[in-house]
Amino acid sequence: EEELQVIQPEKSVSVAAGDSATLNCTVSSLIPVGPIQWFRGAGPGRELIYNLKEGHFPRVTAVSDPTKRNNMDFSIRISNITPADAGTYYCVKFRKGSPDVELKSGAGTELSVRAKPSAPVVSGPAVRATAEHTVSFTCESHGFSPRDITLKWFKNGNELSDVQTNVDPAGKSVSYSIRSTARVLLTRRDVHSQVICEVAHVTLQGDPLRGTANLSEAIRVPPFLEVTQQSMRADNQVNVTCQVTKFYPQRLQLTWLENGNVSRTEMASALPENKDGTYNWTSWLLVNVSAHRDDVKLTCQVEHDGQPAVNKSFSVKVSAHPKEQGSNTAAENTGTNERNIY
């Protein structure tokens, strides 16, 4: 009598995640009586995938009607494939008994799962850095298979070269992850700049996935300070202006000091944006020179984005101006914010 053969015609099958996989198996004879079982893997640790004889396998169905005696087709279909289903599947014939005795195994069919990478997630530095410093951005994407993948970085459309990329794990796995770090040199013009991480994979049919990060989240552009005095007004008041320019982000506190004493504190809010994304702010202070005997040292103190305060001082010469008798008025805090848009 001809020896029983268990035939698995395909050495390998590749399926997209979410699709169904058909694993083919035929036997050359139904003798002796006994079940066909499907396993993933070989050896003692193999995993039972389908047993016509018994059990509940909700994702696995027989391709042909197993209740037809002349049916020698024991192919199965596994629905809703995930990367975790990858592996080598064996169709195995048993002889009925207690226990069932394994007679013959097919050669095995390797199931590989084509899984799309997750949307790339780009994260920037935890703290802001100033222009002319280099910051690192990381890009991560997970769950893809096969392992081959391409990742590119762009800043404002230009590809970055200072990049380090790793795909894990190094060995065989059901799915893979990629992590890439790009080092970006910041300039004062980068508030509106963007970095893009672009991932290309066979499952994406030439339509790469992109993750983005705005450099506005990573950059701090410190302000320029300039304190100027306007011409003396007829009422002996001097208008002193503090111009704070080209800063980012908007979080800024300005304090006026007269001879070292706090005169007024203001917080920047709802400022219009410059074309390059930075902000300008002008604050002014009216100083009644007739209320002072000596020169007045005015200081514009700016604390930007939690950084140490930056000062700019200016002396208002009082000696040149006549004193009003009995006047003890301090510098008036009636100044309003002027906003200069550049």
Epitope: E1, L30, I31, V33, G34, P35, I36, L52, K53, E54, P66, T67, K68, R69, N70, N71, K96, G97, S98, P99, D100
Partner: antibody, heavy 118, light 107 residues
Framework: EVQLVESGGGLVQPGGSLRLSCAAS????????MHWVRQATGKGLEWVSA???????YYTGSVKGRFTISRENAKNSLYLQMNSLRAADTAVYYC????????????WGQGTMVTVSS | DIQMTQSPSSLSASVGDRVTITCRAS??????LAWFQQKPGKAPKSLIY???SLHSGVPSKFSGSGSGTDFTLTISSLQPEDFATYYC?????????FGQGTKLEIK
């Protein structure tokens, strides 16, 4: 429709012979293991004989050497040749189809009565 | 030969009851155990194979369990048409053998 119909039962004297037939319809009999099961009046079920798809035959101890199971593929029929009949062989004889890959009984005929009596 | 022992031999129950019949094999039969239902004057009907798999058309109120030597048939809610005699059978090796039967009667 899958069906099994037995015939050939009747009254026979001890030591006599009888040939039971089972006509199969709705499936190819040669593709299945086929069985004969009997039941004496008021008693339980007793497996008697089987024939495998390869023509291999099996019998219960009490009928070995006296009964012969066979099939005729052209007629899609199963037979049980019963010789040297005894009173203890009196029973309703059922033709039964074995299940696909494990031989679990799935289809039963309606039975035919065999009475061995003088 | 493998001996099959059913218990109880007879059982009285009411409509709506849940009943369990047990079957014990004299040696390990894996799960090659079948259950049959027979009504007077009729051929047996196949209910369950491989201990727990229902034949097509068999209502889900019938369930089987067990492996090795000890098996059970459970009918979850008895209906008038379920009063009959039930047999277990091992079919792991020849000669196939049946239990002596359990007669289920209306109380």
């Amino acid at each position: 429709e899958v069906q099994l119909v037995e015939s050939g039962g009747g009254l026979v004297q001890p030591g006599g012979s009888l040939r039971l037939s089972c006509a199969a319809s709705g499936f190819t009999l040669s593709s299945y293991d086929m069985h004969w099961v009997r039941q004496a009046t008021g008693k339980g079920l007793e497996w008697v004989s089987a024939i495998g798809t390869a023509g291999d035959t099996y019998y219960t101890g009490s009928v070995k050497g006296r009964f012969t199971i066979s099939r005729e593929n052209a007629k899609n029929s199963l037979y049980l040749q019963m010789n040297s009949l005894r009173a203890a062989d009196t029973a309703v004889y059922y033709c039964v189809r074995g299940g696909v890959w494990d031989d679990a009984f799935d289809i039963w005929g309606q039975g035919t009565m065999v009475t061995v009596s003088s | 030969d493998i001996q099959m022992t059913q218990s109880p031999s007879s059982l009285s129950a009411s409509v709506g009851d849940r009943v369990t019949i047990t079957c014990r094999a004299s040696q390990d039969i894996n799960n090659y155990l079948a259950w049959f239902q027979q009504k007077p004057g009729k051929a047996p009907k196949s209910l369950i194979y491989t201990a727990s798999s229902l034949h097509s058309g068999v209502p889900s109120k019938f369930s089987g369990s067990g492996s090795g030597t000890d098996f059970t048939l459970t009918i979850s809610s008895l209906q008038p048409e379920d009063f009959a005699t039930y047999y277990c059978q091992q079919y792991v090796s020849y000669p196939y053998t049946f239990g002596q039967g359990t007669k289920l009667e209306i109380k």
